[in-house]
């Protein structure tokens, strides 16, 4: 239900997409049981959610990954929710870290990030991980979204 | 505060309930510091939250469990947020996985799931876990809820 | 964007602050990319978010910590979201628990808590942890917030 033409609902929920790219930025798709309320929020280049209206947004991401301590770098697996506003540098909004499992061949773990942030028109949010090859893309495991308050 | 008779607030937060049932669907109760905004959302059979109005909802669940790698199956502990819409098959909205701990007798871990989804009138959401006997029911550890945008 | 003078948006997101205090209550600051929508929600004594209006709020916290099983007590690391309403005892709203890692010197883990609760005017929410010295205060790792529905 719309709040009215002047104040429509703005929300998105996108689903992880496996990628052959070596970038640490996760890829997303409008597939499965996704949400894209209207064109006031868009998924750009499969990697970032971009908003057209200024305001407060609750932004969240969930990342499930599978890793093993011996086969990974000593550093933990870190997922970061990042912001790119027009004419500004990228900045980290939220991060979560999980030490790799000792389970073999790998141990699955899930990370959830979420918080309320002010976004400017044209601002984009995206998710970075330390090793995208470890991310789980099975149904429901890894997703990303936002809602405007 | 109500948004108005045409657009009342709709929200719920229910508390986990230990169950002797062998089903993988978690049981919930309106007890402790629970929330049930009005009759536009109801807890049915102690297992599912059912909504009367179509719209976008932020749905979440938190599950704390205690398990041990040696005493559990090789598969990780998985919590799933599932949707049953009238006249449709059940579907998974969100999942999270955590490998069992090596701590003895068991190691506690917490999982959080949350996302924005479109629900139809009469739609129900529920939470499935791989082993309900491992779920922690102490105050605040395991809960389930939603809010309508 | 305000919903109107009678129903302004109320939201906060505050950032963890390392503290020399031995208290188990985490300390927060309005620093970095924080949110404080207006004076209807305030951060008091750097430790609690206090609201002026009654209503339903989605309240969340994220805590990242680094611990080692051998160097910690046998009990898991527990993060608790707590409520103090005027003239009432404190109560636990949400808790999450994670067993300490076997990684050395310590293994990082992240906990996320979130739920919908009715708050009274003057109610305060705060976050307790079993060992504040283990909490990670790097950018984005530990935060706390709420939004009024």
């Amino acid at each position: 239900m719309q709040k009215g033409d002047q104040n429509p609902q703005i929300a998105a929920h996108v689903i992880s997409e496996a990628s052959s790219k070596t970038t640490s930025v996760l890829q997303w798709a409008e597939k499965g049981y996704y949400t894209m309320s209207n064109n006031l929020v868009t998924l750009e280049n499969g990697k970032q959610l971009t908003v057209k209206r200024q305001g407060l947004y609750y932004i969240y991401a969930q990342v499930t990954f599978c890793s093993n301590r011996e086969a990974s770098s000593q550093a933990p697996f870190i997922a970061s929710l990042c912001l790119k506003s027009p004419g500004r540098f990228e900045r980290i909004l939220l991060r979560a870290a999980n030490t790799h499992s000792s389970a073999k061949p790998c141990g699955q773990q899930s990370i959830h990030l979420g918080g309320v942030f002010e976004l400017q028109p044209g601002a984009s949010v995206f998710v970075n991980v330390t090793d995208p090859s470890q991310v789980s893309h099975g149904t429901g495991f890894t997703s990303f979204g936002l809602l405007k308050l | 505060m109500q948004k108005g008779d045409q657009n009342p607030q709709i929200a719920a937060h229910v508390i986990s309930e230990a169950s002797s049932k062998t089903t993988s669907v978690l049981q919930w109760a309106e007890k402790g510091y629970y929330t049930m905004s009005n009759n536009l959302v109801t807890l049915e059979n102690g297992k599912q939250l059912t909504v009367k109005r179509q719209g976008l909802y932020y749905i979440y669940a938190q599950v704390t469990f205690c398990s041990n790698r040696e005493a559990s199956s090789q598969a990780p502990f998985i919590a799933s947020l599932c949707l049953k819409s009238p006249g449709r098959f059940e579907r998974i909205l969100l999942r999270a996985a955590n490998t069992h701990s090596s701590a003895k007798p068991c190691g506690q871990q917490s999982i959080h799931l949350g996302g924005v989804f479109e629900l139809q009138p009469g739609a129900s959401v529920f939470v499935n876990v791989t082993d309900p006997s491992q779920v922690s029911h102490g105050t605040g550890f395991t809960s389930f809820g939603l809010l309508k945008l | 964007m305000q919903k109107g003078d009678q129903n302004p948006q109320i939201a906060a997101h505050v950032i963890s602050e390392a503290s020399s205090k031995t208290t188990s209550v985490l300390q927060w600051a309005e620093k970095g990319y924080y949110t404080m929508s207006n004076n209807l929600v305030t951060l008091e004594n750097g430790k609690q978010l206090t609201v002026k209006r009654q209503g339903l709020y989605y309240i969340y916290a994220q805590v990242t910590f680094c611990s080692n099983r051998e160097a910690s007590s046998q009990a898991p690391f527990i993060a608790s979201l707590c409520l103090k309403s005027p003239g009432r005892f404190e109560r636990i709203l949400l808790r999450a628990a994670n067993t300490h890692s076997s990684a050395k010197p310590c293994g990082q883990q992240s906990i996320h808590l979130g739920g919908v609760f009715e708050l009274q005017p003057g109610a305060s929410v705060f976050v307790n942890v079993t060992d504040p010295s283990q909490v990670s205060h790097g950018t984005g790792f530990t935060s706390f917030g709420l939004l009024k529905l």
Epitope: A18, S20, T64, F65, C66, A71, S72, A103, P105, C106, G107, Q108, S133, Q134, V135, S136, H137, G138, F141, T142 | Q74, A75, P76, A97, T99 | -
Partner: nanobody
């Protein structure tokens, strides 16, 4: 899906060596982690070794220092060199392929029997 065909199994004396091969066809080899599992009579299937596409290797504690996993991406083939074999290594050895985020393989070979006996 990936089709996996193992070869190289057989009978060997304790202390001897064998080299298992696994030829992969179908979907691209590179996004998968190739590994070996084994199942001894009356026991559960267990992890033996795997190799990632950055040539990171991982071994079960019971085979460390004795077994070596390798891969030839140009031939879409993975190998398991088994040295200092023991009677307790007797099992059916399965080649497997998993995506990085999955805790268990999605694709399995038919298996090849390795018997260590004097």
């Amino acid at each position: 899906e990936v089709q996996l065909v193992e070869s190289g199994g057989g009978l060997v004396q304790p202390g001897g060596s064998l080299r298992l091969s696994c030829a992969a066809s179908g979907r691209t080899f590179s996004p998968y982690i190739m590994g070996w599992f084994r199942q001894a009579p009356g026991k559960e299937r267990e992890f033996v070794a795997e190799i990632g596409w950055r040539d990171t290797t991982l071994y079960a504690d019971s085979v460390k220092g004795r077994f070596t996993i390798s891969a030839d991406n140009s031939k879409n083939t993975a190998y398991l060199q088994m040295n200092s074999l023991k009677p307790e290594d007797t099992a059916v050895y399965y080649c497997a392929a998993r995506r990085g985020g999955d805790y268990l393989p999605t694709d399995w070979g038919q298996g090849t029997l390795v018997t260590v006996s004097s």
